[in-house]
């Protein structure tokens, strides 16, 4: 969210998006309202071709890295405002994602569902 001014409160601020190819496509900011929530970033690399990024708030975030037949999943958790700003930059065009989404569907969502 561009030009956001700050409001009172102690909710954690995290970048939030689903299945984007770049951090530049993940600029929405989410208020994590539940006590104990963290910011998370999931990076899914499909057989070395591209990286898909998802971000948001998670109540049960656990740092994780796993290898799958279709690629690799990496999850990072953090607990300061805007701490999930960075993620791997994809080099492939967005069209390539559409072809691979079925294979990656299992991996694309937040840590609560992984």
């Amino acid at each position: 969210m561009a030009g956001l001014a700050l409001q009172p409160g102690t909710a954690l601020l995290c970048y939030s998006c689903k299945a984007q190819v770049s951090n530049e496509d993940c600029l929405q900011v989410e208020n994590c309202t539940q006590l104990g929530e963290q910011c998370w970033t999931a990076r899914i690399r499909a057989v070395g071709l591209l990286t898909v990024i998802s971000k948001g708030c998670s109540l049960n975030c656990v740092d994780d890295s796993q290898d799958y037949y279709v690629g690799k999943k990496n999850i990072t958790c953090c607990d300061t405002d805007l701490c999930n700003a960075s993620g791997a930059h994809a080099l492939q065009p967005a069209a390539a994602i559409l072809a691979l989404l079925p294979a990656l569907g299992l991996l694309l969502w937040g840590p609560g569902q992984l």
Partner: antibody
Framework: VQLQESGGVLVQPGGSLKLSCAAS????????MSWIRQTPDRRLEWVAY????????FYPDTVKGRFSISRDNAKNTLYLQISRLRSGDTAIYYC???????????????WGAGTTVTVSS | DIVMTQSTSSLSASLGDRVTINCGTS??????LNWYQQKPDGSVKLLIY???RLHSGVPSRFSGSGSGTDYSLTISNLEQGDIATYFC?????????FGGGTKLELK
């Protein structure tokens, strides 16, 4: 690794100005940046943040609507546009690089020398 | 906003002394605390990050400690070049805030 601010001048209340910060010695486009000011009473106040691509900006309520941070990664330059200047904006303005340590922790690891803005009639 | 309190605005010490500068926070910041040094010419440098980690190039005479809402910076064997103002800063919650500074002077 260096940051060099410029554009600080004497301005009348209600006026506007644009500060610049030239970065060198590092890959500017890979870092989020901030502006921090030091008021005459020597207090430091963070006033603006911009992410590495320039698409996300944040400000404290004290300056919202009057301050606008931007960047030109091709020119390795950070900017701060200030409008409707008030006497309370009189300060030394520093640009600074945000560096992460681990997933959560970050710090301002490089600071410029600062540029002085004086608001007075 | 998280309020950062450096209760001592100025401190006098002699060369060779061990000096401790304190910083309190209005809420638990989970060790997300940094210390900066500002020399009389206005230049600002990072000294310590994440409560106790020494920034590269900073002498080991500087150390940081603390947790929860209470943090401190210690300078052992004070040298002339340490005469400066020291600021703490929290990186936990927006807006990012600084302490009011502690000016270190020679006796």
């Amino acid at each position: 690794v260096q940051l060099q601010e410029s554009g600080g001048v004497l301005v009348q209340p209600g006026g506007s100005l644009k500060l610049s910060c030239a970065a060198s010695g590092f890959t500017f486009s890979s870092y989020s940046m901030s502006w921090i000011r030091q008021t005459p009473d020597r207090r430091l106040e963070w006033v603006a943040y911009i992410n590495d691509s320039g698409g996300s900006t944040f400000y404290p309520d004290t300056v919202k609507g009057r301050f606008s941070i931007s960047r030109d990664n091709a020119k390795n330059t950070l900017y701060l546009q200030i409008s409707r200047l008030r006497s309370g904006d009189t300060a030394i303005y520093y640009c600074s690089r945000r560096m992460y340590y681990g997933n959560s922790h970050w710090h301002f690891d490089v600071w410029g020398a600062g540029t002085t803005v004086t608001v007075s009639s | 906003d998280i309020v950062m309190t450096q209760s001592t605005s100025s401190l006098s010490a002699s060369l060779g002394d061990r000096v401790t500068i304190n910083c309190g926070t209005s809420q638990d910041i989970n060790n997300y605390l940094n210390w900066y040094q500002q020399k009389p010419d206005g230049s600002v440098k990072l000294l310590i990050y994440y409560t106790s980690r020494l920034h590269s190039g900073v002498p080991s005479r500087f150390s940081g400690s603390g947790s929860g809402t209470d943090y401190s910076l210690t300078i052992s064997n004070l040298e002339q070049g340490d005469i400066a103002t020291y600021f703490c800063q929290q990186s936990k919650t927006l807006p990012w805030t600084f302490g009011g500074g502690t000016k270190l002077e020679l006796k």
